[in-house]
């Protein structure tokens, strides 16, 4: 792209953080090797990634989470990535599900997202998962980002 | 992007090649309907691609792999996407973790990992894993790219 | 991008539907949160994303299906990226390969393909299943996209 | 709580060869550079060699280059370095650390060290 000051280049991956809130949205952070590339892409309270300008990105997340059968509910472990435009309900962009493993304690296991959206100025996207308790935080298993086209 | 002299593009997409070696860094090779955009990017040693340009890039990589519970250790599979800059350590960018099946004589799955990162001219990435031995070759199961934005 | 009229953005994504031909070939359409940037590319016959200009486009998949180890052939379920190209045989870019679950009724895996390859003019890319019957369809399981660089 | 913990010290003869292992605990091993430090007596601390992560790169001062070989088994959290070829000047008591950088003895984390003592 290496566009110029008209069209600047915007992009962001960020981590995962560990939280103590039972809310179901993933929390992330810029630590490690995160990208940011300006102001026109930016992590709001640690879970949302908001963009300025109008247009196609292609937004992807990978969890990596540990359950196990017997010690889950029978439901699924399932990751949504969630569109928020504002003035309007959130709606499910993408979603991944992955059966719990029999492998005792936990079985890890990786979900990878990603898909071309057209996001309006101030929409953000956020990830959800059916149990934030068993994604795993250490470094690379969990991360979220974009890129504008 | 379709881009002029100044600002060619910069793409590359690597197809998985056995190894007698046995580290635990795949190789890979330009062959069958593989990318590799102009001299920007390369493939060295047959086990990582080198960037010349600075700039933001989306790299990705897919693991197919067999395995079975009772004949691997009791960890996962792991797979690391991987950094390495000219004089500093190899970081790990991402990383994705799939519990090995129950099937005999081996249960196959897939990792899928991406995200965009700032890369330095001369920077290679590079994918490690557990096993190598449990990687799967058949045609389009294991590959490596990267696209410049 | 932001590219003027001689560079237009070019991008899709599409929805999976459910489809009552026993065809491995999955069925999509332009409904939900879906992507069509321009004519210059299209969903044809809902099966195959054509597009117009030649080019290095990233492609991508996602499907998540449900299955069971008892009531599934001993073979995994593969999906799989193809190519078609004006005057040539249909030709596989990516695969994915998942064993089935033992967890009944069924379990739910999701399988994400994505890599960068060049296109001709008039080259179509689709996506086949072993068992499109195990496909699920729910919002956002199931996806289909491209991107030009 | 890290807990390095380093092993395969004694008493060798110049030539001879020695085998020193860490065991780690208490944080993600695989995640982190590791390397090897030492402190010959009346001295102060020298790097002598690092590796990274999964092992991909390795770094070695002059002094030890050839001689030594650093490495590790993440399966394991264990750090090794196998040193050959030993001469009175690597006396020294040796720690080892998860590495900062490559090349200096930068480090949060270090254990109690094993001491090495080449001599006839």
């Known amino acids: 792209m290496q566009k110029g000051d008209q069209n600047p280049q915007i992009a962001a991956h960020v981590i995962s953080e560990a939280s103590s809130k039972t809310t179901s949205v993933l929390q992330w952070a810029e630590k490690g090797y995160y990208t940011m590339s300006n102001n026109l892409v930016t992590l709001e309270n640690g879970k949302q990634l908001t963009v300025k300008r109008q247009g196609l990105y292609y937004i992807y997340a990978q969890v990596t989470f540990c359950s196990n059968r017997e010690a889950s509910s029978q439901a699924p472990f399932i990751a949504s990535l969630c569109l928020k435009s504002p003035g309007r309900f959130e709606r499910i962009l993408l979603r991944a599900a992955n059966t719990h493993s029999s492998a005792k304690p936990c079985g890890q296991q990786s979900i990878h997202l990603g898909g071309v959206f057209e996001l309006q100025p101030g929409a953000s996207v956020f990830v959800n998962v059916t149990d934030p308790s068993q994604v795993s935080h250490g470094t690379g298993f969990t991360s979220f980002g974009l890129l504008k086209l | 992007m379709q881009k002029g002299d100044q600002n060619p593009q910069i793409a590359a997409h690597v197809i998985s090649e056995a190894s007698s070696k046995t580290t635990s860094v795949l190789q890979w090779a330009e062959k069958g309907y593989y990318t590799m955009s102009n001299n920007l990017v390369t493939l060295e040693n047959g086990k990582q691609l080198t960037v010349k340009r600075q700039g933001l890039y989306y790299i990705y990589a897919q693991v197919t792999f067999c395995s079975n519970r009772e004949a691997s250790s009791q960890a996962p599979f792991i797979a690391s996407l991987c950094l390495k800059s000219p004089g500093r350590f190899e970081r790990i960018l991402l990383r994705a973790a799939n519990t090995h099946s129950s099937a005999k004589p081996c249960g196959q799955q897939s990792i899928h990992l991406g995200g965009v990162f700032e890369l330095q001219p001369g920077a290679s990435v590079f994918v490690n894993v557990t096993d190598p031995s449990q990687v799967s070759h058949g045609t389009g199961f294991t590959s490596f790219g990267l696209l410049k934005l | 991008m932001q590219k003027g009229d001689q560079n237009p953005q070019i991008a899709a994504h599409v929805i999976s539907e459910a489809s009552s031909k026993t065809t491995s070939v999955l069925q999509w359409a332009e409904k939900g949160y879906y992507t069509m940037s321009n004519n210059l590319v299209t969903l044809e016959n809902g099966k195959q994303l054509t597009v117009k200009r030649q080019g290095l486009y990233y492609i991508y998949a996602q499907v998540t299906f449900c299955s069971n180890r008892e009531a599934s052939s001993q073979a995994p379920f593969i999906a799989s990226l193809c190519l078609k190209s004006p005057g040539r045989f249909e030709r596989i870019l990516l695969r994915a390969a998942n064993t089935h679950s033992s967890a009944k009724p069924c379990g739910q895996q999701s399988i994400h393909l994505g890599g960068v390859f060049e296109l001709q003019p008039g080259a179509s890319v689709f996506v086949n299943v072993t068992d499109p019957s195990q496909v699920s369809h729910g919002t956002g399981f199931t996806s289909f996209g491209l991107l030009k660089l | 709580e890290v807990q390095l913990l380093e092993s395969g010290g004694g008493l060798v003869q110049p030539g001879g060869s020695l085998r020193l292992s860490c065991a780690a605990s208490?944080?993600?091993?695989?995640?982190?550079?590791m390397g090897w430090v030492r402190q010959a007596p009346g001295k102060g601390l020298e790097w002598v060699s690092s590796?990274?992560?999964?092992?991909?790169?390795?770094y070695y001062a002059d002094s030890v280059k050839g001689r030594f070989t650093i490495s590790r088994d993440n399966s394991k959290n264990t750090l090794y370095l196998q040193m050959n070829s030993l001469r009175a000047e690597d006396t020294a008591v040796y720690y080892c650390?998860?590495?900062?950088?490559?090349?200096?003895?930068?480090?949060?984390?270090w254990g109690q060290g094993t001491l090495v003592t080449v001599s006839s």
């Open positions: 650390a998860e590495m900062k950088s490559p090349y200096k003895p930068q480090f949060d984390y």
């Open positions: 208490g944080f993600t091993f695989a995640s982190y550079p």
């Open positions: 590796i990274g992560p999964i092992g991909f790169t390795t």
